[in-house]
C-alpha cells in the first residue's frame, strides 16, 4: 500500500512563436484543473485502457481573466498535491497521464464549455521511497512542469511497498547490519520515539529520547560502524539460530541517513542526500565549515549566510548534491524528447528514438507535426508522413485558420435548408422530412423510423439549439 503524489509547478504557453497568450484568450474567464491517470507497465498499446493503478483530480484553480493589454501573468493553478493511493504493490514501471482541462465560465450559447487543453504521457521506472522526480513536458503549444514520487504507507516498506514489518524496540542477538523485525501482528507494539536522528536501522530505544546502538554500531546516533561480526556473512531472509531478519532488497528501509538526510537506493546499496551542514556516507558528520574542504569534485565552497548552513557548495557542471558528491545522472533531465530512450555513455549522451522521430534528441517528427501549429485550438495529428490538423468546432483548412462553412457540402437532404452556426450546422427540413440532416421521411401516421441517434426536427422546424 502507498500513495503516488504529483505536484504541478506550472502550466502555461511554451517557448517559441505561435504560443497562445493564455488559455482564456478572448473567451472570457476560465479556470483550470488537472486530472492524473496511472497505468501499470510501459507499453503504449494500453492508451485506451482504464487507469488501473488509480486516478485523481485536482481542485479547480482560481478564476483567470485575461487582461488584453497587460503582460500574461503566471496562470493561477489549483493548490496542493494530487494523490493517487494504491492498495497493492507498486509496479515500478508505470505510465503517467496528466490532463489539463479548461472550464469556461462566460455565457456561451449551448451552455458552459469544457475543453481538454493538453495531455502529456510519460512512461517511467520509479522506485517507491525515492526522491521527487522533476519533469517538463510539452503538449502542443503548452508546457507543463511537475514533480512526482511514490511512497509507501501503512507500515509497508521496500521499493515496491510489499514488505510488511516493523522494527522491534528491544535489542537482539543480530549482528551489525541485521535488524530485528516482527511480523505485522496486533501484538506488535509501536516503538517509543527515540532521540531525533537516531538511526532507525542500527539504533533503538526503550525510553523516549534515548538512542542505544545495536551490536557493531556506535556514536550518539548509532550511525558509525564499530567492528565487523561473523553475523555479517548471513544471506537469505533469516538466520535459524538468531531469528534475525536480514535486510531485504530495500537498503533504504528504515532510512539509514541521519540528520534529516534522504535515502535513495542504488544497486545493492544506498546513497544519502544530506542537508546543508552534514556530509558523510550517512550524513553523520556535522559542524563543517569551508576550512574542512567539504565540497568534492572541484566544488567551490562559500560560507553560508544563515546559521543552519555553515557552508554552501557551488558545484561544477556534471556534479550535484549538497557536497557536489554526486555525478549528475544526465538522463534524469529527460533530454530525449518524444519518448526517446536516453543512454548515458559517459563521454556522451545518446538518444534512441521511437519510430517516427529522429534527431540527436529525437526532436524531429518525421510525421511533420513538430513545429506545426494548428490555429484556433486545433490539434496536430501524426500519420501518413504529413501533418494534419484536427480542428475545433467551426474551423477548417490545413491549419484550422479558415472559418469552416459547414453548409458548403450541402449536408441537408431532401431540400432542407442549411444554416451555419458557431458550432456546426443546422438543417430546417422540408415538409415530410425530419432528422438532424432531414434524412428521415415522416410516416403518414406521424411516427418516424428512428435510428439509435436522437430524433431531429419536426417538418419545417429549424433546429436552432445545436
Amino acid at each position: 500500500a502507498g500513495v503516488f503524489e504529483l505536484q504541478i509547478h506550472s502550466f502555461g504557453p511554451g517557448p517559441g512563436p505561435g504560443a497562445p497568450r493564455s488559455p482564456c484568450s478572448a473567451r472570457g474567464p476560465c479556470r483550470l484543473f488537472f486530472r492524473v491517470c496511472l497505468k501499470p507497465g510501459l507499453s503504449e498499446e494500453a492508451a485506451e485502457s482504464p487507469c488501473a493503478l488509480g486516478a485523481a483530480l485536482s481542485a479547480r484553480g482560481p478564476v483567470y481573466t485575461e487582461q488584453p493589454e497587460a503582460p500574461a501573468p503566471d496562470l493561477p493553478l489549483p493548490n496542493g498535491l494530487l494523490q493517487v493511493p494504491f492498495r497493492d504493490a507498486w509496479p515500478g514501471t508505470f505510465s503517467l497521464i496528466i490532463e489539463t482541462w479548461r472550464e469556461e465560465l462566460g455565457d456561451q450559447i449551448g451552455g458552459p464549455a469544457w475543453s481538454l487543453l493538453a495531455r502529456v504521457t510519460r512512461r517511467r521506472r520509479l522506485a517507491a521511497g525515492g526522491p521527487w522526480a522533476r519533469d517538463i513536458q510539452r503538449a502542443g503549444a503548452w508546457e507543463l512542469r511537475f514533480s512526482y514520487r511514490a511512497r509507501c504507507e501503512l507500515l509497508a516498506v521496500g521499493t515496491a511497498c510489499t514488505r510488511l514489518c516493523r522494527p522491534r524496540s528491544a535489542p537482539s542477538r543480530c549482528g551489525p547490519g541485521l535488524r530485528p523485525c516482527a511480523p505485522l501482528e496486533d501484538e506488535c507494539e509501536a516503538p517509543p520515539v527515540c532521540r531525533a536522528g537516531c538511526s532507525l536501522e542500527h539504533g533503538f530505544c526503550e525510553q523516549p529520547g534515548e538512542c542505544r546502538c545495536l551490536e557493531g554500531w556506535t556514536g550518539p546516533l548509532c550511525t558509525v560502524p564499530a567492528s565487523t561480526s561473523s553475523c555479517l556473512g548471513l544471506r537469505g531472509p533469516s538466520s535459524a539460530t538468531t531469528g534475525c531478519l536480514v535486510p531485504g532488497p530495500g537498503p533504504c528501509d528504515g532510512n539509514p541517513c541521519a540528520n534529516g538526510g534522504s535515502c535513495s537506493e542504488t544497486p545493492g546499496s544506498f546513497e544519502c542526500t544530506c542537508p546543508r551542514g552534514f556530509y558523510g556516507l550517512r550524513c553523520e558528520v556535522s559542524g563543517v565549515t569551508c576550512a574542512d574542504g567539504p565540497c568534492f569534485n572541484g566544488g567551490l565552497c562559500v560560507g553560508g549566510a544563515d546559521p543552519d548552513s555553515a557552508y554552501i557548495c557551488h558545484c561544477p557542471p556534471g556534479f550535484q548534491g549538497s557536497n557536489c558528491e554526486k555525478r549528475v545522472d544526465r538522463c534524469s533531465l529527460q533530454p530525449c524528447r518524444n519518448g526517446g530512450l536516453c543512454l548515458d555513455l559517459g563521454h556522451a549522451l545518446r538518444c534512441r528514438c521511437r519510430a517516427g522521430f529522429a534527431g540527436p534528441r529525437c526532436e524531429h517528427n518525421l510525421d511533420d507535426c513538430a513545429g506545426r501549429a494548428c490555429a484556433n485550438g486545433g490539434t496536430c495529428v501524426e500519420g501518413g508522413g504529413a501533418h494534419r490538423c484536427s480542428c475545433a468546432l467551426g474551423f477548417g483548412g490545413r491549419d484550422c485558420r479558415e472559418r469552416a462553412d459547414p453548409c458548403a457540402a450541402r449536408p441537408c437532404a431532401h431540400g432542407g435548408r442549411c444554416y451555419a452556426h458557431f458550432s456546426g450546422l443546422v438543417c430546417a427540413c422540408a415538409p415530410g422530412y425530419m432528422g438532424s440532416r432531414c434524412e428521415f421521411p415522416v410516416h403518414p401516421d406521424g411516427v418516424s423510423a428512428l435510428p439509435a441517434a436522437p430524433p431531429g426536427l419536426r417538418p419545417g422546424d429549424p433546429q436552432r439549439y445545436l
Epitope: 484543473f33 486530472r35 485506451e48 482504464p50 487507469c51 483530480l57 479547480r60 482541462w101 472550464e103 456561451q108 450559447i109 449551448g110 451552455g111 458552459p112 464549455a113 469544457w114 475543453s115 481538454l116 485550438g377 475545433a392 468546432l393 458550432s423 456546426g424 436522437p454 439549439y465 445545436l466
Partner: nanobody
Framework: QVHLMESGGGSVQAGGSLRLSCVAS????????MGWFRQAPGKEREGVAF????????YYGASVKGRFTISQDNAQTTVYLQMSSLKPEDTAMYYC??????????????????WGQGTQVTVSS
C-alpha cells in the same frame, strides 16, 4: 464506443414524481459528461440536466431547475434523473446522452457522441 440504456419512463399525474436511469456500458472510463435531453412533439430538442463526470459538476435547464435532480453512482457509469413536481409541459421523449469528446458545450447536442433510444414521460393534468 459507449452504449446507453434508459429506463424509468412512464405516465404520471401532474405534481407526481418519476426517476429515470441511464446505464452506460463499453468504454465508460472515457466518459466526460452525461445527461438528458428531451423532445416534445413539434418542439426542438431541449437540454434538461447534465453532470460533467470529470468534476461531478451539475447543470440544469432553466425550465427544470429546482424540480429535477441529476446524480451518478459511485462507479460513474449510471446517471439518474429524479423528476419531482412534474408538469404537463414536461411531457416528452427523454434521451440520455454521453460525451467522450475532449471539447463540449454542456447543453449542446453536438458535443455528445453516444445516445440512448429514449424513454417516454407523459404527465397528465
Amino acid at each position: 464506443q459507449v452504449h446507453l440504456m434508459e429506463s424509468g419512463g412512464g405516465s404520471v399525474q401532474a405534481g407526481g414524481s418519476l426517476r429515470l436511469s441511464c446505464v452506460a456500458s463499453g468504454n465508460t472510463y472515457r466518459l466526460n459528461s452525461m445527461g438528458w435531453f428531451r423532445q416534445a412533439p413539434g418542439k426542438e430538442r431541449e437540454g434538461v440536466a447534465f453532470i460533467v463526470m470529470i468534476r461531478g459538476t451539475t447543470y440544469y435547464g432553466a425550465s427544470v431547475k429546482g424540480r429535477f435532480t441529476i446524480s451518478q453512482d459511485n462507479a460513474q457509469t449510471t446517471v439518474y434523473l429524479q423528476m419531482s413536481s412534474l408538469k404537463p409541459e414536461d411531457t416528452a421523449m427523454y434521451y440520455c446522452a454521453a460525451s467522450t469528446k475532449d471539447q463540449f458545450y454542456v447543453f449542446n447536442p453536438i458535443g455528445y457522441d453516444s445516445w440512448g433510444q429514449g424513454t417516454q414521460v407523459t404527465v397528465s393534468s
